[in-house]
Interface confidence: low
């Protein structure tokens, strides 16, 4: 844009410039090319020799301008159209400027301390004749000159007539500036343009309120000689909690948030979260919802999952293995990172579940006890003749540290006894003869405990290598047995199971097999008190 320092057309009153001598330049009323009334200066002393008529403008503050443009609109009479003026008429005039710190007043232009500096000799591209004058064809000339760089606070213009017939229709003085603007959310101040031949003026911008630039690199623009901004470098971005609206940053309204300057617009709060304030940088989770530390602010708030569904188990007693399987929780809490954790409790055979204690390190979990993604697990090394409660908890990224002990679990209670209460090394071979074998074992239920007196034992045996279907069976009410009528020097497989008599007998499993070889006919009996 142009910053006008002087525009003679803008004045309706007299311009009141200084004319010396007084019979030289004369201020008169006229009109511009649009018929608007204006004040002009004219001189036409073409018939008299040695003309030296000066016209000095008032003092012109240069403002921020260093390179100043002077635009002159004038008409000039063709000397050949003026009879008798051939020797004295001129078709040019001179323009000067005089830099000063203050108004010189109305003194003689060349007496101002420093000498006026000539800008140029101005000639008309088109001059008018007497005929044009009669037809009111005033041929307007426009000339623009540049002065500077200026260093003082202001200046006067001076016009020297040396014998022309000239009318100054308009004098306009201005400098070009790049107007104050907001570009890329940065404000740039009005900046005076340099000369057309100089480099661009680099200007640092200031980020608008609630915006920020790249650290250490403010946005910059370059003011060109024509007063246009060029070559923007960098931009500001609305800060977290604010979004761009035209040339400014406005707060995210309630229900919206913006986490980073890198995002252009506020976003609606993710599911199950809210932002009650303006300019929110994140949304707060609703009650009972949370985000995990690894969730981004854009993630929906989630909650711990419900319990696993349809927990089922199968118990095999030879060997003693508890297999569990379950279905995913009905409500995953809105997350995909559901895992499962198992808690094993060993409880008394009777009485409340409160009489339970952790199973301890003896029990093994396959594939693992915690962090399961599988929906199945196996428990090994359970004790026979015990009651176990196994809890399967569903966890996700927002489950608290105590969640596995919380309420989002399913549980089963399983009794492993009284059948097959022994490990293989707990059955003793008390006596081995050619035709008999005596075995003993500890009682699965402590003597005197309820049900202990009712326990019966069933011993199944068969020759090793023979079909298992060809077994023989004996029963006993005590934890010891002697099996007779065996073949000498023959390897037998023995299996024992225990149960209270009744319909549930068939459901019990035999303990792990042990093998015993009867002695040959010549061998004497042996008593072996150590475990087999």
């Amino acid at each position: 844009e142009e910053v006008i320092l002087l525009d003679s057309k803008a004045s309706q009153a007299e311009l009141g410039w200084t004319a010396l001598p007084s019979n030289g330049w004369e201020e008169i009323s006229g009109v511009d090319e649009h018929d608007r009334p204006i004040r002009t200066y004219q001189v036409c002393n073409v018939l008299e020799p040695n003309q030296d008529n000066w016209l000095q403008t008032g003092w012109i503050s240069r403002g921020r301008g260093q390179r100043i443009f002077v635009e002159l609109q004038f008409t000039l009479r063709d000397c050949s159209s003026i009879p008798g003026a051939a020797g004295t008429c001129k078709e040019t005039f001179n323009v000067y400027y005089l830099e000063t710190e203050a108004d010189l007043g109305r003194g003689r232009p060349r007496l101002g301390g420093s000498r006026p500096r000539k800008i140029d000799t101005i000639a008309a591209d088109e001059s008018f004749t007497q005929g044009d004058l009669g037809e009111r064809k005033m041929k307007l000339n426009t000339e623009v000159r540049e002065i500077g760089p200026l260093s003082r606070r202001g200046f006067h213009l001076a016009f020297q007539d040396v014998g022309a017939c000239v009318a100054l229709v308009s004098v306009r003085v201005y400098y070009k500036q790049c107007r104050a603007t907001v570009r890329g959310l940065a404000t740039f101040p009005a900046t005076a343009a340099e000369s057309a031949f100089s480099t661009l003026v680099e200007v640092a911008g200031t980020c608008v309120a609630h915006s920020e630039g790249e650290p250490g690199s403010p946005p910059r623009m370059h003011c060109g000689a024509d007063g246009e901004w060029l070559v923007p470098v960098g931009r500001c971005s609305c800060s977290a909690g604010f979004q761009e609206r035209g040339d400014f940053c406005e707060a995210c309204p309630p229900g919206f948030y913006k986490v980073s300057p890198r995002r252009p617009l506020c976003s609606p709060c993710p599911e199950h979260s809210r932002a009650l304030e303006n300019a929110s940088t994140f949304c707060v989770c609703q009650d009972s919802y949370a985000r995990s530390p690894t969730d981004p602010p854009s993630a929906s708030c989630t909650r711990p999952p419900s319990a696993p569904r349809d927990l089922q188990y199968s118990l095999s007693r030879s060997p003693l293995v508890l297999r569990l399987r379950w279905l995913p929780p009905a409500d995953s809490g809105g997350r995909s990172d559901v895992t499962y954790s198992l808690l094993c409790l060993r409880c008394g055979r009777e009485g409340p579940a409160g009489a339970c204690e952790p199973c301890g390190p003896r029990v093994a979990f396959l594939p693992r006890q915690a962090g399961l993604r599988e929906r199945a697990a196996t428990l090994l090394h359970l004790r026979p003749g015990a009651r176990y409660t196994v809890r399967v908890a569903a966890l996700n990224g927002v489950s608290g540290p105590a969640a596995a002990a919380g309420t989002t679990y399913a549980q089963v209670t399983v009794s492993t006894g009284p059948g097959a209460p022994w490990e293989e090394d707990e059955i003793r071979r008390d006596r081995v003869e050619p035709q008999s074998v005596s075995l003993s074992w500890r009682e699965p239920i402590p003597a005197g405990a309820p049900g202990a007196n009712d326990t019966e034992y069933e011993i199944r045996y068969y020759e090793k290598g023979q079909s298992e279907q060809t077994y023989s069976m004996v029963k006993t009410g005590a934890p010891t047995v002697t099996v007779t009528n065996l073949k000498p020097a023959t390897r037998y497989v023995f299996q024992i199971r225990a149960a209270s008599p009744g319909p549930s007998w068939e459901a019990q499993s035999f303990n792990p097999s042990i093998e015993v070889q009867t002695l040959g006919e010549a061998a004497s009996g042996s008593r072996d008190q150590s475990p087999a």
């Epitope: 890329g184 923007p232 035209g246 040339d247 995210c252 309204p253 617009l265 506020c266 976003s267 609606p268």
Partner: antibody
Framework: QVTLKESGPTLVKPTQTLTLTCTFS??????????VGWIRQPPGKALEWLAH???????RYNPALKSRLTITKDTSKNQVVLTMTNMDPVDTATYYC???????????WGQGTLVTVSS | DIVMTQTPLSLSVTPGQPASISCRSS???????????LNWYLQKPGQSPQLLIY???NRFSGVPDRFSGSGSGTDFTLKISRVEAEDVGVYYC?????????FGQGTKLEIK
């Protein structure tokens, strides 16, 4: 498919208040960058922008008419309502609602509704 | 307010021939992001306006490639490389840089 439809009275008396409803589908005013505006066109004349409302309830009005205009939205109903008070016969025009999106600007228009102001 | 001036106001073109419409704004339409929010619309007889070009030169989806836009600052042009019968109607430019948004007065395109 984006569609907008204007509804409201076809005839109002001078000094009365005009209430127009824009019902839209194919987009949501809860989506960042979306807006809905009102534009009118007197018979045989050019278009004149009246008001706009964006997803975050920011509103802009034509300064020449601002004292007479109110624009509101109901995101759940996919509706935008424009009220214009103190109607005059010179307000006779076809009133259009139109969607604004980022970056295209005013991109989809309703079919328009002709409102005649006459006693 | 920004004044949008379209020229010519009417245009009669033979099918297959090119057409050009000018739109001039009273101030620069480049905003602080460096974007120029100048759109072109066609209003066919009895219909609502439809977007042809947005941001000076971007064709909207479904707009034939015979339509193109150009310009910067304050001077903008819509060109139709080969006019077809279906192109008749009134063409409007719209600036969305400054509030109030303002339209040009329209250019009526007819087929010879």
């Amino acid at each position: 498919q984006v569609t907008l439809k204007e509804s409201g009275p076809t005839l109002v008396k001078p000094t009365q208040t005009l209430t127009l409803t824009c019902t839209f589908s194919g987009f949501s005013l809860s989506t960042s960058g979306m807006g809905v505006g009102w534009i009118r066109q007197p018979p045989g004349k050019a278009l004149e922008w009246l008001a706009h409302i964006w997803w975050d309830d920011v509103k802009r009005y034509n300064p020449a008419l601002k004292s007479r205009l109110t624009i509101t939205k109901d995101t759940s109903k996919n509706q935008v309502v424009l009220t214009m008070t103190n109607m005059d016969p010179v307000d006779t025009a076809t009133y259009y609602c139109a969607r604004t999106s980022f970056p295209a600007g005013v991109d989809y228009w309703g079919q328009g509704t002709l409102v005649t102001v006459s006693s | 307010d920004i004044v949008m001036t379209q020229t010519p106001l009417s245009l009669s073109v033979t099918p297959g021939q090119p057409a050009s419409i000018s739109c001039r704004s009273s101030q620069s339409l480049q905003n602080s992001n460096g974007n120029t929010r100048l759109n072109w619309y066609l209003q066919k007889p009895g219909q609502s306006p439809q977007l042809l070009i947005y941001r000076v030169s971007n064709r909207f989806s479904g707009v034939p490639d015979r339509f193109s836009g150009s310009g910067s600052g304050t001077d903008f042009t819509l060109k139709i490389s080969r006019v077809e019968a279906e192109d008749v109607g009134v063409y409007y430019c719209l600036q969305e840089t400054h509030v109030p948004f303002t339209f040009g007065q329209g250019t009526k395109l007819e087929i010879k």
